[in-house]
Interface confidence: low
């Protein structure tokens, strides 16, 4: 009789889930020399060992523990790059602005982005099927908690002014239930975070409203300003002449607002 | 270091149900799966199925009505029980430790153990 | 289910280069592992390449594996050719339900 598997809501584990993790690893530890010394092959064990033979609604922070110490990096603290719902830009600008760091330019976030994986309560069998989504299922699945326990240390980890690329097309610009909302908000420091500066990004080439008047973003600042960290909002009005003068600091139309 | 030694008995008749232990050292059987694998003659190499750490088992499609894995955590041991023998059963079955977990090979075979049913 | 096809005999002089080819009949050769063993007479099967092209550190750099997706192949490669690599080679992979699939064997000869 062959074992019911659960089937859930969402999409099944990535294809070459294993394959993929361990060549990043091994790409990502060539390129940065700093973390050549990391075993790729410990790393997958512990990436394994956080959901594999355990039930996918029943992840808990802990069991990416070993993960976590594997993957400790160091990161400049006055570096950091948060973004919410527009993550393409944002990486977009860390491969230009090379001293700025996203979660997924560091070594864990660069692992799993773009992936999803889920095991089975006791077998090791990973789901190619169907894995929990956080909404229809629940909310203790394996990539959601690990990515609320990376986002976790990546804000703590911060200090000095901190950068958050923000998704000016979206009726939220600021939204509560995301990872920026509901995890790193929170985990900024205030004792060693002086201020937040938000980047609302527009999409539109005739958008010349103020965005930072958004009421989402007046949310923003309130959570902020509660915690004692000071808050600060630029319109970004044009992504694509922002990113060129990144590039090119001194060319003569980027003295002009972008 | 890693081992694995498979036993039984070598020689069975037609209809009777074979019975071959694998024991291992030098690793837990709930850290690797192992895997069953037979080698009939002059044949290839035919996967059986495995137990894995958590304890269910797979079994391969072909073989599936006369197969039973199983294992003593204990012991570390893994038993192979294939029922109603058939002549064409007869060959060498080894054990065998999955490598790793993701890439599904194998990196240590038991010595292997001859199997033969006469009718 | 796919399958591994791999042809029954391969020979080569001393010193030379012989591939063994393996081809998988559906499906993506590039979605799983390839695997290749090394068995000679009445030993059990040595694993000499995993994950593809990866070489256990044992294993003599003779030996290297590939993939090739226009023919929907793996192959393994044995370079400078000696008498002890006369033995069958298996190439192994696995399907989605993580079943294991061997292919046929190819028994090499050194001439």
């Known amino acids: 009789v062959p074992r019911w598997r659960q089937q859930w809501s969402g999409p099944g584990t990535t294809k070459r889930f294993p394959e993929t993790v361990l060549a990043r690893c091994v790409k990502y530890t060539e390129i940065h020399p700093e973390m050549r010394h990391v075993d790729c092959q410990s790393v997958w064990d512990a990436f394994k060992g956080a959901f594999i033979s355990k039930h996918p609604c029943n992840i808990t922070e802990e069991d990416y523990q070993p993960l976590m110490k594997l993957g400790t990096q160091t990161v400049p603290c006055n570096k950091i790059l948060l973004w919410s719902r527009i993550k393409d830009l944002a990486h977009q600008f860390t491969q230009v602005q090379r001293d700025m760091f996203t979660l997924e330019d560091t070594l864990l976030g660069y692992l799993a982005d773009d992936l999803t994986w889920c095991g089975e309560f006791n077998t090791s069998k990973i789901n190619y099927q169907s894995c929990p989504d956080w909404r229809k299922d629940c909310s203790n699945n394996p990539v959601s908690v690990f990515w609320k326990t990376v986002s976790r240390r990546f804000a703590e980890a911060a200090c000095d002014v901190v950068h958050v690329m923000l998704n000016g097309s979206r009726s939220k610009i600021f939204d509560k239930n995301s990872t920026f909302g509901s995890v790193e908000v929170h985990n900024l420091q205030p004792e060693k975070v002086q201020t937040l500066e938000a980047w609302v990004i527009h999409g539109g080439r005739e958008d010349s409203r103020d965005l930072c008047q958004d009421p989402t973003i007046k949310e923003l600042e309130s959570i902020i300003s509660k915690r004692n960290i000071q808050f600060s909002c630029k319109n970004i009005y044009r992504p694509d002449k922002f990113l060129q003068c990144v590039k090119n600091p001194e060319d003569s139309s980027c003295t002009s607002e972008i | 270091q890693v081992q694995l030694k498979e036993s039984g008995p070598g020689l069975l008749l037609s209809s009777e149900t074979l019975s071959l232990t694998c024991t291992v050292s030098?690793?837990?059987?709930?850290?690797?799966?192992v895997s069953w694998v037979r080698q009939l003659p002059g044949r290839g190499l035919e996967w059986m199925g495995r137990?894995?750490?958590?304890?269910?088992?797979d079994y391969n499609s072909d073989l599936k009505s006369r197969l039973s894995i199983s294992r003593d955590i204990a012991k570390s041991q893994v038993f192979l029980k294939m029922s109603n023998l058939k002549t064409e059963d007869t060959g060498t079955y080894y054990c065998?430790?999955?490598?790793?977990?993701?890439?599904?090979?194998?990196?240590?075979w038991g010595p292997g153990t001859m199997v033969t049913v006469s009718s | 289910q796919f399958t591994l096809t791999q042809p029954k005999s391969v020979s080569g002089s001393l010193r030379s280069t012989i591939t063994i080819p393996c081809e998988r009949s559906?499906?993506?050769?590039?979605?799983?592992?390839v695997t290749w063993y090394q068995q000679h007479l009445g030993r059990p099967p040595l694993n000499v390449i995993y994950?593809?092209?990866?070489?256990p550190s044992e294993v003599s750099d003779r030996f290297s594996g590939s993939i090739d997706s226009s023919s929907n192949s793996a192959s393994l490669t044995i370079t400078n050719l000696q008498m002890d690599d006369e033995a069958d080679y298996f190439c192994?992979?696995?399907?989605?339900?993580?079943?294991?699939?061997f292919g046929g064997g190819t028994k090499v000869t050194v001439l």
């Open positions: 065998a430790r999955a490598y790793g977990f993701n890439y599904w090979s194998f990196d240590f």
């Open positions: 030098g690793f837990s059987l709930t850290s690797y799966e």
């Open positions: 137990v894995w750490i958590g304890g269910d088992t």
């Open positions: 559906s499906g993506d050769i590039g979605d799983n592992y």
């Open positions: 994950a593809d092209d990866q070489r």
């Open positions: 192994q992979s696995y399907d989605s339900n993580t079943d294991i699939i």
